[in-house]
């Protein structure tokens, strides 16, 4: 049930914490971790409903 890593940079984070593409910033421990360790959105097939509008997908967020 893991959501996959994301590599798109969004426009709403002017100063993101730098993480490599397969990593996401863990706000609670304040460092980058594997995206698979966090409950982040998984890419869905076209037409599938999403849990939230996520136009700014960024591992760094």
């Amino acid at each position: 049930m893991r959501r996959g890593p994301r590599s798109l940079r969004g426009r709403d984070a002017p100063a993101p914490t730098p993480c490599v593409p397969a990593e996401c910033f863990d706000l609670l421990v304040r460092h980058c971790v594997a995206c698979a360790l966090l409950r982040t959105p998984r890419p869905k097939p076209a037409g599938a409903s999403s849990p939230a509008p996520r136009t700014a997908l960024q591992p760094q967020e």
Epitope: R2, A13, P16, L28, L37, T40, R54, L57, Q60, E61
Partner: antibody, heavy 118, light 113 residues
């Protein structure tokens, strides 16, 4: 869909230990942060703590050393223990999952009302 | 801990009216990464809280467009343009910028006048 369900006794005597279970379906507790939040009569919400993907924990300092959150990954459950309860611990207890991109609580259990009374 | 001050505590409205709820934080909620992790939840009677708005102004999936969020820094507002019966309940703001702990506002009860 991810679903959470709290279970445990609805009545606990003062000075005893409150023990609750959160059963998670549709997701693995080895990913993300799994949380306990309680709502007091009068609508105040209090964040109690979490257990993380790695098994590390955080406890709200307001609960001092009375709280323990543990997990059983084989059952996909996590647990709350609150020691030495008083009537002030009467509340509705919720378990909740945390979105790891925008950091909101995206999934909540239905909640269980725990009354502390002799 | 960040203190979230929500006003009013009770908001009596007539159906079709606009409602406005204010939330103020004791420190700026702008994270060092530039994002502002201020969210709004609605708890309807007999239900658990449900996310309405995330990151100040983004409506969660399925939330009607009569709900809107705005603000920056320490001052935030949730507006409901035309209140419907299904909107009644307790609204909470919450911050995830300075965590842990996550903190919540004291709640605003939206009720029929």
């Amino acid at each position: 869909d991810v679903q959470l369900q709290e279970s445990g006794p609805s009545l606990v005597k003062p000075s005893q230990t409150l023990s609750l279970t959160c059963s998670v379906t549709g997701d693995s507790i080895t990913s993300g942060y799994w949380n306990w939040i309680r709502k007091f009569p009068g609508n105040k919400l209090e964040y109690m703590g979490y257990i993380s993907y790695s098994g590390s924990t955080y406890y709200n300092p307001s609960l001092k050393s009375r709280i323990s959150i543990t997990r059983d990954t084989s059952k996909n459950q996590f647990y709350l223990q609150l020691l030495s309860v008083t009537t002030e611990d009467t509340a509705t207890y919720y378990c909740a999952g945390l979105d790891g991109l925008y950091w909101y609580f995206d999934v909540w259990g239905a909640g269980t009302l725990v009354t502390v009374s002799s | 801990d960040i203190v979230m001050t929500q006003t009013p505590l009770s908001l009596p409205v007539s159906l079709g009216d606009q409602a406005s709820i204010s939330c103020r934080s004791s420190q700026s909620l702008v994270h060092s990464n530039g994002n502002t992790y201020l969210h709004w939840y609605l708890q309807k009677p007999g239900q658990s809280p449900k996310l309405l708005i995330y990151k100040v102004s983004n409506r969660f999936s399925g939330v009607p467009d009569r709900f809107s969020g705005s603000g920056s820094g320490t001052d935030f507002t949730l507006k409901i343009s035309r209140v419907e019966a299904e909107d009644l309940g307790v609204y909470f703001c919450s911050q995830s910028t300075h965590v842990p702990p996550f903190t919540f506002g004291s709640g605003t009860k939206l009720e029929i006048k």
